[in-house]
Interface confidence: low
């Protein structure tokens, strides 16, 4: 991707991180969320990225031969889901505060929550245009990654934001990758 720029939604961020602009020839992008399992707890976070952060990305899409006429604006979900005492106003901050421990915080990650489908036009060097239908991220959330530490005193389920009811396969596509396809 060319001309990639990212701005931060400051209500959720401590330190900016650029958007993740990787792509392959079919415009498929897998987002790397903020799942953070640290053997050393929080001691590495002197230059910490905290919170499930919504990074606003502006980029031009290219399939190798053609480039989008106008830039695509979307969110990139990044960062770490750290303990609520550290993050009083992060995304998902209302869930199960009293149960949150440093240990359990390591079992959450920042993932795509809401998406929308839109069409973009790519201008080709030979003068022709191509239209792609793509899915862009519009919101992020913290999601539990594992149940391996399900101690009875930790009601992890109560902290999970409700999932939107969608067709199973569409929900998978929307929440697990940014899917780009030829229309």
């Amino acid at each position: 991707f060319k001309n990639d720029a990212t701005e931060i939604l400051y209500s959720h961020v401590v330190k900016p991180v650029p958007a993740h602009p990787s792509s392959n020839s079919t415009l498929n992008q897998a987002r790397n969320g903020g799942r953070h399992f640290s053997n050393t707890g929080l001691d590495r976070n002197t230059r910490v990225q905290v919170g499930c952060r919504e990074l606003r990305s502006t980029k031009y899409i290219s399939d190798g031969q053609c480039t989008s006429i106008s830039p695509l604006k979307e969110l990139v979900c990044a960062g770490e889901c750290l303990p609520l005492p550290v993050l009083p106003n992060w995304i998902g901050g209302g869930y199960g505060t009293k149960y949150w421990s440093r240990r359990s915080s390591q079992e959450w990650r920042c993932v795509n929550d809401k998406t929308r489908t839109q069409r973009i036009q790519l201008q080709c060097q030979d003068g022709s245009t191509r239209t792609y239908k793509i899915t862009v991220v519009t919101a992020c959330k913290c999601k539990r990654y594992t149940r391996q530490h399900n101690e009875s005193s930790h009601n992890f389920e109560s902290m999970s934001p409700a999932k939107p009811v969608q067709h199973h396969r569409e929900r998978k596509r929307a929440s697990k990758s940014s899917k780009h396809s030829m229309s």
């Epitope: 987002r31 053997n39 910490v48 990139v76 990044a78 998978k172």
Partner: antibody, heavy 118, light 107 residues
Framework: QVQLVQSGAEVKKPGSSVKVSCKAS????????ISWVRQAPGQGLEWMGW????????RYNRKFTGRVTITADESTSTAYMELSSLRSEDTAVYYC???????????WGQGTLVTVSS | DIQMTQSPLSLSASVGDRVAITCRAS??????LNWYQQKPGKPPKIVIY???GLPSGVPSRFSGGGSGTDFTLVISTLQPEDFATYYC?????????FGGGTKVEIS
Amino acid sequence: QVQLVQSGAEVKKPGSSVKVSCKASGGTFSSTYISWVRQAPGQGLEWMGWIYAGTGGTRYNRKFTGRVTITADESTSTAYMELSSLRSEDTAVYYCAREGVDGWFTYWGQGTLVTVSS
Amino acid sequence: DIQMTQSPLSLSASVGDRVAITCRASQSISDSLNWYQQKPGKPPKIVIYAASGLPSGVPSRFSGGGSGTDFTLVISTLQPEDFATYYCQQSYSAPLTFGGGTKVEIS
């Protein structure tokens, strides 16, 4: 296009250490998880651990705890895997792999053969 | 740790055949199951993610199904380039674990 390029093959003595590098290009390194997966000759795949490049946060497979150290250098977009106290059963191809959003490996390095022999 | 058990260990098939490989997890992993194809001397390649998601660029003859503990990878019409070893992998909890692999050979 995302690419992971690993360092070359190594021959090591039992008891020594090996450090394999994995240079990433074509993406934002700081917001990615790099895992290390090994494969002994004729055997299956074994996950060793991962690093979240933005913070250096790591998670290791208990089997390797104390012997494996995964690090990352943001300035060069390179991840490293160091395995110590090598034994013959550590002879394997070591892969670095970059995870997608929910724990599947979207991109892989070409692999580095580490041979442990006296 | 979650154990992943694949079956069969190997299978012989012909071009055009329908092939199914199963993977069983030692505990429920929801839909956090991925399938990889590996050819000799090459790194694995993702063919199905999240139990049934088809990555861009992977032919539609590959499909995945299942949830909880039992999963299936199906190749509807086997092609010459599909002869390889296939691995399942759970991404539900660390340590991430793989099945032992299923080698699809030419009969």
